[in-house]
């Protein structure tokens, strides 16, 4: 950066090199050039010469003032106009940054994705800080009182092998940057309660010719968890509203779910599961598209032959076996 240049003087920032976005700041430049009583001192920001708000303080020093500085990063340097020198002489440079102190991390969540061998902890970091912000994840065993700390810039994967202090833990997150530090509330977890089953995947669909044609969706998961509850949501691609069906599932065999759908319409299906009675759901599976036939012939759609688009984490709460609509969309 600009800070690696050889200086013939000194440049500094008040209140600090890293400061709160929107503040008024002063950048000072002090020349120390042999045989030069500077006629003028010039400031440059990102290579652009500044014209206004420059005040000469004394023979060797000038100040550049910025009101309501909003740029996350800027490279500043200053130069001197020396008598009998044709070109400006470089004095010094400095990289400056503006941003915000971190918000209190909230929505701390820790889950174990089946087969991952990790506990993944995430949180809502709040508003963008614009400056380097680090997070320390504290994991404290409620059985042994032993505490471990993990430094990260975003989320963290903690090997389950390193969680040797039993099953119950307190987890909290500390956020810190040059402008401040905040700490989340403590989350109490039990390792057995935070496992998310292996992803459920829709493999194919077929519409069977009958008096009333029906569509069968084939789906499966590699989970070894015995009691799994799943939801399948579906809608015509032209609709905003999802229909949601709930299932208590045993994945010892491929699941088949029947739907009575309108003819000649493109539908989209997604599935997600959780260990029955537990808190965390899988994210919705990739969208699976199936177009129902106009008339009677059998139509099959296979997985991985569909368009892809980002799925959300829409939630539906219904009674087992009950068909509902979820108006929240994606």
């Amino acid at each position: 950066g600009i800070t690696n240049i050889n200086c013939s003087g000194h440049i500094w920032v008040e209140p600090a090199t890293i400061f709160k976005m929107g503040m008024n700041i002063s950048i000072y430049c002090q020349a120390a050039i042999k045989n030069c009583q500077p006629r003028k001192l010039h400031f440059y920001k990102n290579g652009i010469k500044e014209r206004f708000q420059i005040t000469r303080i004394n023979k060797t020093t000038a100040r550049l003032w910025y009101k309501n500085f909003l740029e996350p990063h800027a490279s500043m340097y200053c130069t001197a106009e020396c008598p009998k020198h044709f070109q400006e002489t470089l004095i010094c440079g400095k990289d400056i940054s503006s941003g915000y102190p971190p918000d209190i991390p909230d929505e701390v969540t820790c889950v174990i994705y089946e087969y991952s061998g990790n506990m993944t902890c995430t949180w809502n970091a709040g508003k963008l800080t614009y400056i380097d912000t680090k997070y320390v994840v504290h994991v404290k065993s409620l059985e042994t009182e032993e505490e471990q700390q993990y430094l990260t810039s975003s989320y963290i994967n903690i090997s389950t092998d390193s969680l040797q202090g039993g099953k119950k833990y307190l987890v909290w997150v500390q956020a810190a940057n040059a402008l401040g530090m905040e700490e989340s509330k403590q989350l109490q977890i039990h390792l057995d309660d935070i496992v998310i089953p292996s992803a459920a995947v829709i493999s194919r669909a077929e519409t069977i010719n009958a008096t009333v044609p029906k569509t069968i969706i084939y789906w499966d998961s590699q989970t070894t968890i015995e009691k799994v509850s799943c939801e399948m949501r579906y809608k015509a691609t032209t609709n905003q509203t999802w229909n949601v069906k709930e299932f208590d599932t045993n994945f010892t065999y491929v699941q088949q779910s029947e739907f009575y759908l309108e003819p000649n319409i493109k539908y989209v299906f997604q599935v997600r599961c959780q260990e029955t009675g537990k808190r965390y759901w899988q994210p919705w599976s990739s969208p699976f598209f199936h177009k129902t036939p106009e008339t009677v012939p059998q139509v099959t759609s296979k997985a991985f032959q569909h368009d892809t688009w980002n799925s959300g984490l829409t939630v539906a709460s219904i009674s087992t076996g009950h068909l509902t609509s979820d108006n929240r969309g994606d």
Epitope: R39, I54, P83
Partner: antibody, heavy 119, light 107 residues
Framework: EVKLVESGGGLEQPKGSLKLSCTVS????????MSWVRQAPGKGLDLVAD??????????YYADSVKDRFTISRDDSQSMVYLEMDNLKTEDTALYYC??????????WGQGVMVTVSS | DIQMTQSPASLSASLGETVSIECLAS??????LAWYQQKPGKSPQLLIY???SLQDGVPSRFSGSGSGTQYSLKINSLESEDAATYFC?????????FGGGTKLELK
């Protein structure tokens, strides 16, 4: 030879508008700052508006008395500088000079163009 | 903005005399001062910049001096063509500001 030629002056009523132009030749226009300096009859010199070169990101300055009424602009490809004057007042009556600065002092001046604001 | 006070407002002198015009800045301007000559019906011409540097083509009877807040323009051996109004300009801090002018008449 450095030449600055102003045009566009004349008689205008209060609240009226005029656009002054300045054609420049004889030096590297792109690296120079351009200003309009005015001189009311029998009075001193006042900087009205200034537009800097690309190295200053074309930063502009206006005297408080003309802020929000006057607009300075430049066309580097044509070596031209302009001063659009709206909502003219009688106190804007003056001889308007187009000037060049490489440092901050005004090195070269045009012959001036008269602007008279009167009802 | 930096204020420039020029004195005298007018002066009358004879051919061959030496005259001085003063400019006082409201704060130290670190030799960032220029002097201009304006003849009746003409545009100003740069005489001196950086307080003491003579612009090309300007006769050597013109000289500038000073430091800090006080600066002066000296004209030696006045000639008839020197009858004009003289202005100082500070360009130490933005915006540049002019002195009020000194009208020099020849007797």
């Amino acid at each position: 030879e450095v030449k600055l030629v102003e045009s566009g002056g004349g008689l205008e009523q209060p609240k009226g508008s005029l656009k002054l132009s300045c054609t420049v030749s004889g030096f590297d226009f792109n690296s120079a700052g351009m200003s309009w300096v005015r001189q009311a009859p029998g009075k001193g010199l006042d900087l009205v508006a200034d537009i800097n070169s690309k190295s200053y990101n074309y930063a502009t300055y206006y005297a408080d008395s003309v802020k929000d009424r006057f607009t300075i602009s430049r066309d580097d490809s044509q070596s031209m500088v302009y001063l659009e004057m709206d909502n003219l007042k009688t106190e804007d009556t003056a001889l308007y000079y187009c000037t060049v600065h490489h440092s901050d002092y005004f090195e070269y001046w045009g012959q001036g163009v008269m602007v008279t604001v009167s009802s | 903005d930096i204020q420039m006070t020029q004195s005298p407002a007018s002066l009358s002198a004879s051919l061959g005399e030496t005259v001085s015009i003063e400019c006082l800045a409201s704060e130290d301007i670190y030799n960032n001062l220029a002097w201009y000559q304006q003849k009746p019906g003409k545009s100003p011409q740069l005489l001196i910049y950086h307080a003491s540097s003579l612009q090309d083509g300007v006769p050597s009877r013109f000289s500038g001096s000073g430091s800090g807040t006080q600066y002066s323009l000296k004209i030696n051996s006045l000639e008839s063509e020197d009858a004009a109004t003289y202005f100082c300009l500070q360009d130490s801090e933005y915006p540049p500001t002019f002195g009020g002018g000194t009208k020099l008449e020849l007797k």
